[in-house]
């Protein structure tokens, strides 16, 4: 489980080495907590293991275990990062039959500076 509307420490081992250490759920895919996100991330492990893009780990963590700042703001990955990773890994994605979630389609994400990310409020995004 997770604390409602507050940032929580990252517990997904793969993402514990990221430059951020707090996250918030649900994520972009609507995964309710870190244990679900970790299981769903496993489909992408061949990409991460083979490092098809230098940014693959960062992107997967930002997508599945998003950065949380100012208590209730979730920071989705930026579009440029998504485009770079998708183009680097496209052939592996196809050869390994990895389903790219609709919510992570790059044209759904916003252009932003990775160092000053765009945030969205999960209250309105997920709770309508």
């Amino acid at each position: 489980g997770h604390s409602l509307f507050t940032c929580e420490p990252i517990t997904v081992p793969r993402c514990m080495k990221m430059a951020y250490n707090m996250t918030f759920f649900p994520n972009l895919m609507g995964h309710y907590d870190q244990s679900i996100a970790a299981v769903e991330m496993e489909h992408f492990l061949p990409l991460a293991n083979l490092e098809c893009s230098p940014n693959i780990e960062t992107f997967l963590c930002k997508a599945f275990v998003p950065t949380c700042i100012e208590q209730i703001h979730v920071v989705p990955p930026c579009r440029k990062l998504c485009e770079k990773v998708y183009s680097d890994c496209k052939k592996l994605i196809d050869t390994f039959g990895i389903r790219w979630p609709e919510e992570l389609e790059c044209d759904r994400l916003q252009y932003c500076d990775e160092t000053v990310p765009v945030t969205f409020d999960p209250h309105t995004e997920f709770l309508g």
């Epitope: 293991n49 083979l50 490092e51 196809d94």
Partner: antibody
Framework: QVQLVQSGAEVKKPGASVKVSCKAS????????MNWVRQAPGQGLEWMGI????????SYAQKFQGRVTMTRDTSTSTVYMELSSLRSEDTAVYYC??????????????WGQGTLVTVSS | DIQMTQSPSSLSASVGDRVTITCRAS??????LAWYQQKPGKAPKLLIY???TLQSGVPSRFSGSGSGTDFTLTISSLQPEDFATYYC?????????FGQGTKLEIK
Amino acid sequence: QVQLVQSGAEVKKPGASVKVSCKASGYTFTSYYMNWVRQAPGQGLEWMGIISPSGGSTSYAQKFQGRVTMTRDTSTSTVYMELSSLRSEDTAVYYCARWGDYGDLYYFDYWGQGTLVTVSS
Amino acid sequence: DIQMTQSPSSLSASVGDRVTITCRASQGISSALAWYQQKPGKAPKLLIYATSTLQSGVPSRFSGSGSGTDFTLTISSLQPEDFATYYCQQVNSYPPTFGQGTKLEIK
């Protein structure tokens, strides 16, 4: 022309480890992923895992996770496959196979000649 | 993992015969299928990729067809050098998997 030349046959005791090498030539070594596939006597082909020769990163079939290690040496254009805790069922011919780039997908376009590993007490 | 099932597992035919080998995937794999030929004591050799595209240097008597779950390899007129074992392989899902093989023997 593309060539993958593997090390010679090995006989090992149960519980031991074996390290098979595959030396590539005739193409840019770091531009193509390399796979390892094995074939038990009279049996079909079984994929073991893959290594990226540029970065050395790997992905292994679940069945071999924890027992297999794939490495590479870019200075000699060689990839290695080490299998530990050998048992009799690991007796097989082990092949390295290059992943060729065919449009949208990868296929195994060049294969080494194979290395027979026999596990017997 | 996707299971690949080939039929028949062995087949006897004569030089000049037309031969068809089938391969069925346990789930749809689009057209991400390859066929390999293996002769005794030798490594497999890529014959066909993307279901129907002949690898460079492969004779035109070999052809492939199908999509989704059902695929075929056809040899229009068997030559003596075609007697071998043939494997299908899918590359549409992790991990890549092979059929169990079809051994083509001289009648």
